[in-house]
């Protein structure tokens, strides 16, 4: 089964600013990526960004910058201020739709003991959700 990995990092310069990186390990052509927080997309989660390889990128506050890193991975920077800013135990989820294969979603949150600015290399996410 294809895997989705999710990596959450708190920025050292802005302690309430987060970077989420997600990647897809599988076959097919990625047709859509949806990033949400507070739970899986469509199951209580709130959409932060939608990335389409041809139609472009849409993002919603507190998302500041969503972009493609490679053909199969994305990153999203979240603003660190305001009532809607994330906290340390917020769950972030990424859903990859891959044509004509399927769609897969995984979730992750900030590691409990993580130091700002430090992060482990991406590994398959602990939560892998196949819709």
């Amino acid at each position: 089964t294809p895997e989705v990995w999710v990596q959450v990092r708190m920025e050292a310069t802005e302690l309430s600013s987060f970077t989420i990186r997600c990647g897809f390990l599988g076959s097919g052509s990625i047709s859509l990526v949806t990033v949400s927080w507070g739970g899986p997309n469509g199951a209580g989660g709130t959409t932060l960004a939608v990335l389409h390889p041809e139609r472009g990128i849409r993002q919603w506050a507190p998302a500041r910058q969503a972009r493609w890193e490679t053909q199969s991975s994305i990153s999203l920077i979240l603003e660190g201020s305001g009532a809607s800013s994330p906290c340390a135990n917020t769950t972030f989820c990424c859903k990859f739709a891959s044509f004509p294969e399927g769609s897969w979603e995984a979730c992750g949150s900030l590691p409990p003991s993580s130091d700002p600015g430090l992060s482990a290399p991406p590994t398959p996410a602990p939560i892998l959700r196949a819709d």
């Epitope: 052509s29 294969e101 399927g102 769609s103 196949a130 819709d131």
Partner: antibody, heavy 113, light 107 residues
Framework: EVQLQQSGPVLVKPGASVKMSCKAS????????INWVKQSHGKSLEWIGL????????NYNQKFKDKATLTVDKSSTTAYMEFNTLTSEDSSVYYC??????WGQGTTLTVSS | DIQMTQSPSSLSASLGERVSLTCRAS??????LNWLQQEPDGTIKRLIY???SLDSGVPKRFSGSRSGSDYSLTISSLESEDFVDYYC?????????FGGGTKLEIK
Amino acid sequence: EVQLQQSGPVLVKPGASVKMSCKASGNTFNGYYINWVKQSHGKSLEWIGLIDPSNGGTNYNQKFKDKATLTVDKSSTTAYMEFNTLTSEDSSVYYCAGGTVYWGQGTTLTVSS
Amino acid sequence: DIQMTQSPSSLSASLGERVSLTCRASQDIGNNLNWLQQEPDGTIKRLIYATSSLDSGVPKRFSGSRSGSDYSLTISSLESEDFVDYYCLQYASSPPTFGGGTKLEIK
């Protein structure tokens, strides 16, 4: 691993409709779209369309959009393809596939009066 | 629709021989190409995805490569069970399209 079991061979008359099934084992589609593919006798393969079992969303090959209807029953983890207004040109083997990796054994459709 | 021209349509070869099958795409498809194997009873199995990635459980004698718009499936040393049909499949754009197939026969 997703295993797909397709319904048996069918013989129908021209002008009729037929509905074939594709049952996923283990009570899950495991995230995979269900693709449907046509193989005419001794010929190559043609993609008919796909359905996303999670939400019922479909994507059809324009050539088949008025001929095929794809549906899914999540409770029984079964995908269906209905073919309407059948002619002899529709006599073929039809495959369902989970993505492009897991393939059913095929359903033979014969249209004859 | 993207046309996939597969050659040869049939190929006679001997056990242990190295063979290559080719598909040419009518438009740019990047690496969005799979190779499928079909047995006489109709059973279909994916061998290669994304041009060159081997599916799990597929013998290492199978490999995939690309040169421009030409995509190749190579079998390094033919075994008896390899004498079946092969198809390429592009999925760069909808609808996905298949090559016409290659029938691999024993000499």
